[in-house]
């Protein structure tokens, strides 16, 4: 018996078809994924091949304007329309709190959504309960297939599931669910998750009776053969391991932003076991046409963005300094700004011996590309900020020993004076330099603000010590040269949109003021 | 038309069997999933089980798992239930019924109904 | 195992009234629920689909409605051919399936 599992995951707001880079798309012509291009491919295998389910591994919440202004309701509206089988909740999807996940697609999904490691208590358990499941079964075809949901046990610490949801270990959460469906007579199951390609692996070796793993969240690219585009595979599609109990498990992921669809084939013997696995993800490239009634439908929902981009998000009483000449060479105020912002945005009160989690912030100055001027009645929309941050990146989490954020704020000036991009802005650090030393010696003081204090001071960064720090996903991927960040992370989880953190901090300030207050000094 | 013929009633001894036919005909036996449903005398409805005719696959209610066993014989197009270990509280009509499925939302039904067999078990 | 109520076991009325027959899922089971008539000495007859949808050739005097947890079947106008059993059906724990325990429709 052979099934077809068409996955996306980490889709992340791309309603719309993007550039190659998943950035706005620019040139149509050259552009990729979109609803209404998924559609088309999805549509074709559906009529092609008799058992096909459609699944999602989450995050299909945050990234662009689109979930800023429809918060999910967009999600709900054309992932119904796409006839999605399944999802499975992503770390982001709780973003909004858990009303903004239960309001928008909870109550208007027509398909289910599932994590059997997130349990819900006090008085959210009788609210949420049956909106999400810890499993589905569906019959396809002539058979019946199980579906378990995982999410990242990180979430509380990612986003904003509140107090009343726990996201237990996920092969503790996962095995009496799989062994439930076992007594059903289910025999041949699907983990559908959120906790990365390294989890995904170990549910696949941990996990008794899981036949295949569909994930998400460390938008792993997987490949057999000849790439199509830019992704450098992080292993073959499937990538096969072998479980304790001797089983072949394949274990597939799609990338992100909707660029590729996840196409897996599997054959099931009569016992339910696999006997092959094959297939590719598959490049939504625009030699696939975008479905014309949901092409329609995306323009229709679209007009409310163009109208939201020119609203009044709040007001700046003094000149933002987002100019080169400046966030290239020394402390900006935009760039303080988009800091506290990034370290707003990331405030989870984690137990009384910390005030937060996080209290750091790094930002290349190349990366913030308008000022903004006050005088325009301080108004500040989300098209001044879009000047600001272009590029439609994110604001991630990561981990870092000490010794690699010195070497960072090393590479932040080794050539200094030239206008590039690479001069870090900072929150939650203040950096003393002396460019009279030669490149690789110049940061002469570094001191952080301490997250285990009930009054934050700064002390002297230790170059042993694991620090969090908030910053752009193009850091956490090396970019700008910090091939340190890349190299030496010890954990990297995606976050917010940038844009859309800065808008919201602005909103929540209403009047914002930032100041140069030696944050980066020069001796 | 669709019809399903069930087997006539019957009185069983405690502690024995009964085997239970229901012959499909009117659409494609192998494309549709057969359940069994059982009705004790003035009471509800209790699903037992489903079985695909053309896979053979199988799902029980946890409840019947070591009294019902389900099978097809599809050159005569018929399902079969075997009731075994029989006691008074098996005594009851037992219907099978043809299941479909489709549609968004998935939609999930039973749309024809054969006439029922009733089961007695006395000594 | 999610529990079906139909807490009315019998519900009665008069030729070319309306009545209300409803039933409670112990958990949110969204839309997936069906109904069923059993008139006296036959089998079960499907009546409603997905909580709303008719089935094929049911009179539109036959409506059903509700979602998460509260499900109603509503019959206008009732004739006499109305009086029967009728249950309803969960089937959002496919592959299990759950009865309601029944409302015997009483035509006085």
């Known amino acids: 018996w052979e099934l077809t599992i068409l996955h996306t995951n980490d889709v992340h707001s791309r309603l719309e078809q993007t550039s190659e880079d998943s950035s706005k798309c620019v040139n149509a012509s050259r552009c990729m994924g979109g609803v209404a291009r998924l559609f088309t491919k999805v549509q074709q295998i559906r009529r092609a091949e008799p058992n096909v389910l459609l699944l999602d591994a989450g995050d299909q919440y945050q990234g662009t304007i689109w979930f800023t202004v429809y918060k999910g309701a967009e999600v709900a509206h054309f992932m119904n329309a796409l006839r999605y089988d399944a999802m499975a909740l992503g770390n982001h999807e709780f973003d909004n709190g858990v009303e903004g996940l239960i309001e928008p697609l909870l109550k208007e999904a027509k398909f289910p959504i599932l994590s059997a490691n997130i349990k819900a208590k006090g008085p959210l358990a009788s609210q949420i309960s049956g909106l999400y499941l810890p499993y589905k079964v569906l019959p396809v075809g002539d058979e019946v297939v199980g579906i378990v949901g995982y999410t990242s046990k990180e979430t509380p610490f990612l986003s904003n599931p509140g107090t009343n949801l726990v996201f237990e270990d996920e092969i503790t959460a996962l095995q009496p669910e799989v062994d439930k469906l076992k007594t059903l007579n289910v025999n041949k199951i699907i983990a559908l998750g959120h906790s990365g390609f390294e989890t995904d692996k170990l549910i696949a070796q941990k996990v008794r009776g899981v036949d295949v793993v569909v994930g998400g969240h460390s938008n792993t690219f997987l490949y057999t053969g000849n790439p199509p585009s830019k992704e450098v595979p992080a292993g073959k599609y499937p990538f096969i391991v072998t479980s304790d109990d001797g089983r072949k498990v394949p274990v597939v992921q799609a990338y992100a932003f909707g660029k590729y669809l996840g196409y897996l084939k599997i054959e099931f013997d009569e016992r339910g076991n696999v006997i092959s696995s094959h297939g590719n993800p598959i490049l939504l490239n625009s030699s696939i046409p975008e479905d014309p009634s949901i092409k329609a439908d995306i323009n229709k929902w679209r007009i409310k963005l163009d109208n939201y981009s020119t609203q009044e998000l709040g007001k700046t009483i003094v000149y933002l300094d987002g100019s080169s000449q400046s966030c290239r060479f020394r402390e900006c105020n935009m760039g303080n700004l988009i800091c506290d912002a990034m370290i707003n945005n990331n405030l989870r009160h984690a137990d009384e011996m910390f005030w937060n989690h996080v209290s750091m912030c790094i930002l290349n100055g190349g990366g913030i590309r308008s000022p903004i001027d006050e005088r325009n009645n301080g108004t500040i929309t989300w098209e001044n900020l879009a000047a600001v941050l272009p590029f439609g990146g994110t604001f991630d989490l990561v981990q870092l020993k000490g010794s690699t954020l010195k070497k960072a704020f090393e590479h932040s000036v080794h050539r200094y004076g030239q206008s590039t991009g690479e001069f870090l802005q900072v929150g939650g650090i203040h950096v003393v330099y002396d460019l009279s030393r030669k490149p690789g010696d110049r940061v002469v003081k570094l001191d952080v603000l301490c997250t285990k204090c009930r009054v934050p001071s700064y002390d002297p960064l230790k170059m042993d010590e694991i620090y969090k720090v908030i910053l752009p996903n193009f850091l956490a991927n090396g970019g700008d040269g910090f091939q340190m960040i890349k190299d030496e992370l010890l954990r990297h989880d995606s976050g917010d949109q940038d844009i859309n953190v800065v808008s919201t901090y602005i909103s929540k300030m209403k009047v914002i003021y930032p100041a140069v207050e030696g944050r980066i000094k020069f001796s | 038309q669709v019809q399903l013929q069930q087997s006539g009633a019957g009185l069983v001894k405690p502690g024995a069997s009964v085997k239970l036919s229901c012959k499909a005909s009117g659409y494609t036996f192998t494309n549709y999933w057969m359940h069994w449903v059982k009705q004790r005398p003035g009471q509800g409805l209790e699903w037992i089980g489903m079985i695909h005719p053309n896979s053979g696959s199988t799902n029980n209610n946890e409840k019947f798992k070591n009294k019902a066993t389900l099978t097809v014989d599809k050159s005569s197009n018929t399902a079969y239930m075997q009731l075994s270990s029989l006691t008074s509280e098996d005594s009851a009509v037992y219907y099978c019924a043809r299941f479909f499925f489709g549609g968004y939302p998935h939609y999930y039904a039973l749309d024809y109904w054969g006439q029922g067999t009733s089961v007695t078990v006395s000594s | 195992d999610i529990v079906m109520t139909q807490s009315q076991k019998f519900m009665s009325t008069t030729v070319g009234d309306r009545v209300s027959i409803t039933c409670k899922a112990s958990q949110n089971v969204g839309t997936a629920v069906a109904w069923y008539q059993q008139k006296p000495g036959q089998s079960p007859k499907l009546l409603i689909y997905?909580?709303?949808d008719r089935y094929t050739g049911v009179p539109d005097r036959l409506t059903g409605s509700g979602s998460g947890t509260d499900f109603t079947l509503t019959i206008s106008n009732v004739q006499s051919e109305d009086l029967a059993d009728y249950f309803c059906q969960q089937y959002s724990s496919f592959p299990l399936f759950t009865f309601g325990s029944g409302t015997k429709l009483v035509i006085q």
């Open positions: 997905s909580a709303s």
